[in-house]
Interface confidence: medium
C-alpha cells in the first residue's frame, strides 16, 4: 500500500554476500538405490551467496567455493529394526560472492 | 558414500532459530493492477525461522512475529520515462522460534 509512509524506514538492499542457510540432507545424497533408511541430522547449516545486485543484468554468484565433508547417521530399517551406520555427505559452502554478468542471451524485444 | 570417514566432522543439526534471509519484493505486493513499473530495492533482509527439530512430529515455527513497514521506490514507466514514487511494503520478521507439534496424524508403521 502507499499509506503510512512516515513510520516506514527506507528499505535497504540485501547486498550480495554469504549468508547462513539451512541445507536439507536428502536421502538421495547418501544412497540412490535404497529408500529404506533415515538420515540424521536431517539438515545442517551451509554458507551460501544470496542477495541482489544493482543491475538487472547481473546476478549474485559464488566466486569461491569450498567442499566440506560431514559425517551423518544412516539409520537403516531392517525388519522394522534400526541399524546405525555412518555416511559421509559433502556440503558446498560459498566463501565469496560477486555480482556477475548473466551470460544467457537476452530475449529480443 | 561411506568412505573417508576420518576427515569428516560430525554433522551438527541446524537448530530451529531465526536466521537472516533474503526476501524478494515482488511487484504484486505494491500494485496488483499494474505491471508497468519497477521496484527498488528488489530484495531486502528479513529474519525467518529455519532449521530442524529433534523429533519427527514437530516443525520449526515462529512463536513471535513482527511486522515491519519499509519504504521502497516504485518506478513507473510512463511513455518510456520513469516516474519515481514511494510505496510501503510490510515485511514479516520472525523474532522467536519453537519446535511445535504438527497436528497431522502420523502414518501407521
Amino acid at each position: 500500500s502507499l499509506g503510512s509512509l512516515t513510520i516506514a524506514e527506507p528499505a535497504m538492499i540485501a547486498e550480495c554476500k554469504t549468508r547462513t542457510e539451512v541445507f536439507e540432507i536428502s536421502r538421495r545424497l547418501i544412497d540412490r538405490t535404497n529408500a529404506n533408511f533415515l538420515v540424521w541430522p536431517p539438515c545442517v547449516e551451509v554458507q551460501r551467496c544470496s542477495g541482489c545486485c544493482n543491475n538487472r543484468n547481473v546476478q549474485c554468484r559464488p566466486t569461491q567455493v569450498q567442499l566440506r565433508p560431514v559425517q551423518v547417521r544412516k539409520i537403516e530399517i531392517v525388519r522394522k529394526k534400526p541399524i546405525f551406520k555412518k555416511a559421509t555427505v559433502t556440503l558446498e559452502d560459498h566463501l565469496a560472492c560477486k555480482c556477475e554478468t548473466v551470460a544467457a542471451a537476452r530475449p529480443v524485444t | 558414500s561411506l568412505g573417508s570417514l576420518t576427515i569428516a566432522e560430525p554433522a551438527m543439526i541446524a537448530e530451529c532459530k531465526t536466521r537472516t534471509e533474503v526476501f524478494e519484493i515482488s511487484r504484486r505486493l505494491i500494485d496488483r493492477t499494474n505491471a508497468n513499473f519497477l521496484v527498488w530495492p528488489p530484495c531486502v533482509e528479513v529474519q525467518r525461522c529455519s532449521g530442524c527439530c529433534n523429533n519427527r512430529n514437530v516443525q520449526c515455527r515462529p512463536t513471535q512475529v513482527q511486522l515491519r513497514p519499509v519504504q521502497v521506490r516504485k518506478i513507473e514507466i510512463v511513455r518510456k520515462k520513469p516516474i519515481f514514487k514511494k510505496a510501503t511494503v510490510t515485511l514479516e520478521d520472525h523474532l522467536a522460534c519453537k519446535c511445535e507439534t504438527v497436528a497431522a496424524a502420523r502414518p501407521v508403521t
Epitope: W40, I75, K81, P82, I83 | P10, N54, R56
Partner: antibody
Framework: EVQLLQSGGGLVKPGGSLRLSCAAS????????MSWVRQAPGKGLEWVSY????????YYADSVKGRFTISRDNSKNTLYLQMNSLRAEDTAVYYC?????????????WGQGTLVTVSS | SYELTQPPSVSVSPGQTASITCSGD??????VHWYQQKPGQSPVLVIY???NRPSGIPERFSGSNSGNTATLTISGTQAMDEADYYC?????????FGGGTKLTVL
C-alpha cells in the same frame, strides 16, 4: 530442573513381578526416546530395553525378551518397566535414561537408579 | 551378538594422559559414546558420537573412533577423574555397552 525420578524397586521372590516407574520433569518427555539400563552388583552396565518417543518402537536385550515389557505414558511423563518371571540374575540397580533424539543415540540424562533384588 | 571389549583397568599419574580403548568389529562404522561412573552414582555422558563433548564436560576429555577401535583420552588427568568408564554403541537394534574400565589415578 531437568530430571528423572525412579521408583518401584524392592525385594521380590524368583518368578515374581515388579513394575518400575521413571517420572520425567523439566523437559518435553514426549519428544525423547528412553531406555532402561541395569547394573548387577559389582558388574558393568547392561542395556535392557528401549522405547521410541511415541512408543511405536520397542527393543529388548535377549536376556529379558519375553519377560520384560517397556511402556510409556506421555500424558503422565512417565516411563515404565514391567518385569515378570524374575530370576536371581535380574538382581541389579535399574536406571532409566533419556536419548536426546527420537531414534536413540547417546544417553544424556540418567535417573538415580532403583535396586531390584530377586531372592527367596 | 555384538560385543565391545575394554581393558579392565588403566592406571595413570596425575597430570598425565590416560587412554582407554574400546574394540569391536568394524566399530568405526558406528557412533561410540563414553560414560563415566563414580561409586554409588549414576553414569554421566562424557563423550558422544565418537568425539563430541556435552556441555559441562571438561576439555581434557576427548574421543576418537576408526577401524575397530574407539579411544577415550583424558589429558592432564586429575584425581577427580578416577572412575569407571564405559563405551557404548547403538548397533543392530541393541544398545551395547563395553565391560567397563576402572581408571585409577595414582
Amino acid at each position: 530442573e531437568v530430571q528423572l525420578l525412579q521408583s518401584g524397586g524392592g525385594l521380590v521372590k524368583p518368578g515374581g513381578s515388579l513394575r518400575l516407574s521413571c517420572a520425567a520433569s523439566g523437559f518435553t518427555f514426549s519428544s525423547y526416546a528412553m531406555s532402561w539400563v541395569r547394573q548387577a552388583p559389582g558388574k558393568g552396565l547392561e542395556w535392557v530395553s528401549y522405547i521410541s518417543d511415541d512408543g511405536s518402537l520397542k527393543y529388548y536385550a535377549d536376556s529379558v525378551k519375553g519377560r520384560f515389557t517397556i511402556s510409556r505414558d506421555n500424558s503422565k511423563n512417565t516411563l515404565y518397566l514391567q518385569m515378570n518371571s524374575l530370576r536371581a540374575e535380574d538382581t541389579a540397580v535399574y536406571y532409566c535414561a533419556r536419548h536426546p533424539y527420537w531414534y536413540g543415540g547417546q544417553l544424556d540424562l540418567w535417573g538415580q537408579g532403583t535396586l531390584v533384588t530377586v531372592s527367596s | 551378538s555384538y560385543e565391545l571389549t575394554q581393558p579392565p583397568s588403566v592406571s595413570v599419574s596425575p597430570g598425565q594422559t590416560a587412554s582407554i580403548t574400546c574394540s569391536g568389529d568394524s566399530l568405526g562404522s558406528y557412533f561410540v559414546h563414553w560414560y563415566q561412573q563414580k561409586p554409588g552414582q549414576s553414569p554421566v555422558l562424557v563423550i558422544y558420537d565418537d568425539s563430541n563433548r556435552p556441555s559441562g564436560i571438561p576439555e581434557r576429555f576427548s574421543g576418537s573412533n576408526s577401524g575397530n577401535t574407539a579411544t577415550l583420552t583424558i589429558s592432564g588427568t586429575q584425581a577427580m577423574d578416577e572412575a569407571d568408564y564405559y563405551c557404548s554403541a547403538f548397533t543392530h537394534n541393541s544398545n551395547v555397552f563395553g565391560g567397563g574400565t576402572k581408571l585409577t589415578v595414582l
